[in-house]
């Protein structure tokens, strides 16, 4: 399906509005430090050029690839060397190496100021004054902070963002209407970004086969009535979409995602009975809805898998002669029967099955060797089940904040070299698994919990990759994508760690803590907790609890004091001394 001009093709397919939005996202994800105005200028130039190509596909440069066009445009930025340093060297390269170079310089933790939400009236005025600029700025700010955000999904978020302002800026109580909507978009956006980051990591670090295996398992759970050929087609198409988005090919990605949604809706009878409502929605909502659709009911009359994959004496012949189809079919059949398992567990089972066949099909009596392969699955299934049971009990006992604290201590002891902000961020997110998943019945707990933990641990992995400090983190992150969580769970206290020198400044607090939101105050306390553990990794739970309780009382007391700053200074010194004594520092 070759087109004379790729840029004209995508402009026509996507329409001007989506074209401009996607180019802005692409540029902001590549050049994360560039000012908004510079990006808008570049986008406008690209859009004008695209229009000339739509008018005449044979016009000069219209036959160039999108990477060439976009890369050339990015390389016109005057301050590239001063702002981005060695990233400027990318511009000396030819495509496709230039694009690969830009991709390698994407920063998961860019040094950007935190987004501060203005007053509602200020936001509404800005929205009414220039709606287009207001929405572009939203795309720009999210894209530059989340360089792997799933671009077509960001268009959906922007549509909801616009709808929130359109509705709430006319409301009697603007703040009551708008703020909860913005909070929801922020939280969903962070979750969406993290989920997509895992997909990109899967593709980039472990390859297409790993991503396809994940997709087979997930789609088979979601569409258990769809036959293998249908699931395989969806997996191939979905892999193409995510490969494009993760590779910075956002126009192709959005276009192909729309085609995939169209195909799914045209063939929903052979895919899932749950798609009807999704398929009645407009494009962006439709694609989002399909991505989140609940699992269809399992078909009736599914026979045991043992007959074909264990009991048959021809397993090795089938495996040898049609490896990928045979293993793919195994994963598909197992996953559609087990919506109660996490995707990563299903992939572990498939890997165990494959390893067993590799070993047994070379043995003297293959059938005798692989006859008990399903027995090997039992401990693999029980391990996450037990872990989730124990942690949900702990969560129900402690509540979210204290459960997060328990995880903070646990993970700081495992990998104390990791930076405190990363440990706080990751442990807080790990702790959210409780309120997210423990409310579910048994049959939904594991897929909710373990697949969510995979997303969170990937955040740790990508942040750690930027500045590696722990061999243990590197090992767990790189050895096996599906065994990351068991790898981290299995880590004990790092006995090689030399405790951090005590620094009183780390434990000095000021009156500004009193004006922080509850969430920000929690983060301050949790930051102190991580630092405590780094100073005293052998501290017991009881010791840490006593210090944290004293700390909470100290903050509460000083925030009620008339002279807050004096209170923090004087009582703070006492608290540090008492804590040192309690912990034997």
């Amino acid at each position: 399906d070759a087109h004379k001009s790729e840029v004209a093709h995508r402009f026509k397919d996507l329409g001007e509005e989506n074209f401009k939005a996607l180019v802005l996202i692409a540029f902001a994800q590549y050049l994360q430090q560039c000012p908004f105005e510079d990006h808008v200028k570049l986008v406008n130039e690209v859009t004008e050029f695209a229009k000339t190509c739509v008018a005449d596909e044979s016009a000069e440069n219209c036959d160039k690839s999108l990477h060439t066009l976009f890369g050339d445009k990015l390389c016109t930025v005057a301050t590239l060397r001063e702002t981005y340093g060695e990233m400027a060297d990318c511009c000396a390269k030819q495509e496709p190496e230039r694009n690969e170079c830009f991709l390698q310089h994407k920063d998961d933790n860019p040094n950007l100021p935190r987004l501060v939400r203005p007053e509602v009236d200020v936001m509404c005025t800005a929205f009414h004054d220039n709606e287009e600029t207001f929405l572009k700025k939203y795309l720009y700010e999210i894209a530059r902070r989340h360089p792997y955000f799933y671009a077509p999904e960001l268009l959906f978020f922007a549509k909801r963002y616009k709808a929130a302002f359109t509705e709430c800026c006319q409301a009697a109580d603007k703040a009551a209407c708008l703020l909860p909507k913005l909070d929801e978009l922020r939280d969903e956006g962070k979750a969406s970004s993290a989920k997509q980051r895992l997909k990109c990591a899967s593709l980039q670090k472990f390859g297409e086969r790993a991503f396809k295996a994940w997709a087979v398992a997930r789609l088979s759970q979601r569409f258990p009535k769809a036959e293998f050929a249908e699931v395989s087609k969806l997996v191939t198409d979905l892999t193409k979409v995510h490969t494009e988005c993760c590779h910075g090919d956002l126009l192709e990605c959005a276009d192909d995602r729309a085609d995939l949604a169209k195909y799914i809706c045209e063939n929903q009878d052979s895919i899932s009975s749950k798609l009807k409502e999704c398929c009645e929605k407009p494009l962006l909502e439709k694609s989002h809805c399909i991505a989140e659709v609940e699992n269809d009911e399992m078909p009736a009359d599914l026979p045991s898998l043992a007959a074909d994959f264990v009991e048959s004496k021809d397993v090795c012949k089938n495996y040898a002669e049609a490896k990928d189809v045979f293993l793919g079919m195994f994963l598909y059949e197992y996953a559609r029967r087990h919506p109660d398992y996490s995707v990563v567990l299903l992939l572990r089972l498939a890997k165990t099955y494959e390893t067993t066949l590799e070993k047994c099909c070379a043995a003297a009596d293959p059938h005798e060797c692989y006859a008990k392969v399903f027995d090997e699955f039992k401990p693999l299934v029980e391990e996450p089940q037990n872990l989730i049971k124990q942690n949900c009990e702990l969560f129900e006992q402690l509540g979210e904040y204290k459960f997060q604290n328990a995880l903070l201590v646990r993970y700081t002891k495992k990998v104390p070299q990791v930076s405190t902000p990363t440990l706080v961020e990751v442990s807080r997110n790990l702790g959210k698994v409780g309120s997210k998943c423990c409310k579910h019945p048994e049959a939904k707990r594991m897929p909710c919990a373990e697949d969510y933990l995979s997303v969170v641990l990937n955040q740790l992995c990508v942040l750690h990759e930027k500045t590696p400090v722990s061999d243990r983190v590197t090992k767990c992150c790189t050895e096996s994508l599906v065994n990351r969580r068991p790898c981290f769970s299995a880590l004990e206290v790092d006995e090689t760690y030399v405790p951090k020198e005590f620094n009183a400044e780390t434990f000095t607090f000021h009156a500004d803590i009193c004006t922080l939101s509850e969430k920000e105050r929690q983060i301050k306390k949790q930051t102190a907790l991580v630092e405590l553990v780094k100073h005293k990794p052998k501290a017991t739970k009881e010791q840490l609890k006593a210090v944290m309780d004293d700390f909470a009382a100290f903050v509460e007391k000083c925030c009620k004091a008339d002279d807050k700053e004096t209170c923090f200074a004087e009582e703070g010194k006492k608290l540090v001394a008492a804590s040192q004594a309690a912990l034997g520092l």
Epitope: A229, S270, A306, S312, K313, A322, M329
Partner: antibody
């Protein structure tokens, strides 16, 4: 509608050849092991062989050599090539879908069958 | 392997409880199916994996057994149940075998 339709049966002389077709509709044949089963007049069911999702064919011992199963996924059709036909090959030939891609059973979906008569 | 069904024919009345057995020449675990066939029609799957009832099949049909010995039971015969019944063993290899058949007729 999910169904299987056999065709290609008819009268053939001893020693002759015949190719039966089984056209699938409402599902993709490549996802399943597709079987051929025959039933001589007034007799029981006799499995001939199947072709699985890995395109590997298996046959009953008695069918090896004379019978060949193949498929064309683009046409969503499976075939049974029968050579050196004998009078005892006279039967209704059924096409049946396995439960999965590598399944030898059970068979929930069957065609209506096509009659093959071997006679001079 | 071979499957032997007994009896080869059976006469019974509406309302009767009927039992058909199927014996395998070697263990096939629970990989046995039961089919019902009426003249001029293809077989219809009743039971799979020895005891699992196919959706849409009346609950008066039940299956049991494992290893080498299997049973199909019709708890209370209905007029539409008069037909020929076959067992099928599968899963031990990529081949499959049908039983010899049991013809159930009206007494």
């Amino acid at each position: 509608e999910v169904q299987l339709v056999e065709s290609g049966g008819g009268l053939v002389q001893p020693g002759g050849s015949l190719r039966l077709s089984c056209a699938a509709s409402g599902f993709s044949l490549s996802s399943y092991a597709m079987n051929w089963v025959r039933q001589a007049p007034g007799k029981g069911l006799e499995w001939i062989g199947h072709i699985n999702a890995g395109d590997i064919a298996y046959y009953a011992t008695w069918a090896k050599g004379r019978f060949t199963i193949s498929r064309d996924n683009s046409k969503n059709t499976v075939y049974l090539q029968m050579n050196s036909l004998r009078a005892e090959d006279t039967a209704v030939y059924f096409c049946a879908r396995g439960a999965g891609g590598f399944s030898t059973g059970p068979f929930k979906l069957w065609g209506q069958g096509t009659l093959v008569t071997v006679s001079s | 392997f071979e499957l032997t069904q007994s009896p080869s024919s059976l006469s019974a009345s509406v309302g009767d409880r009927v039992t058909i057995t199927c014996q395998a020449s070697e263990s096939i675990n629970s990989r046995l199916a039961w089919y019902q066939q009426k003249p001029g029609q293809p077989p219809k799957l009743l039971i799979y994996d020895a005891s699992d009832l196919t959706s849409g099949v009346p609950s008066r049909f039940s299956g049991s057994g494992s290893g080498t010995d299997f049973t199909l039971t019709i708890s209370s015969l209905q007029p539409e149940d008069f037909a020929t019944y076959y067992c099928q063993g599968y899963g031990g290899s990529s081949t499959t075998t049908f039983g010899t058949g049991t013809k159930l007729t009206v007494l």
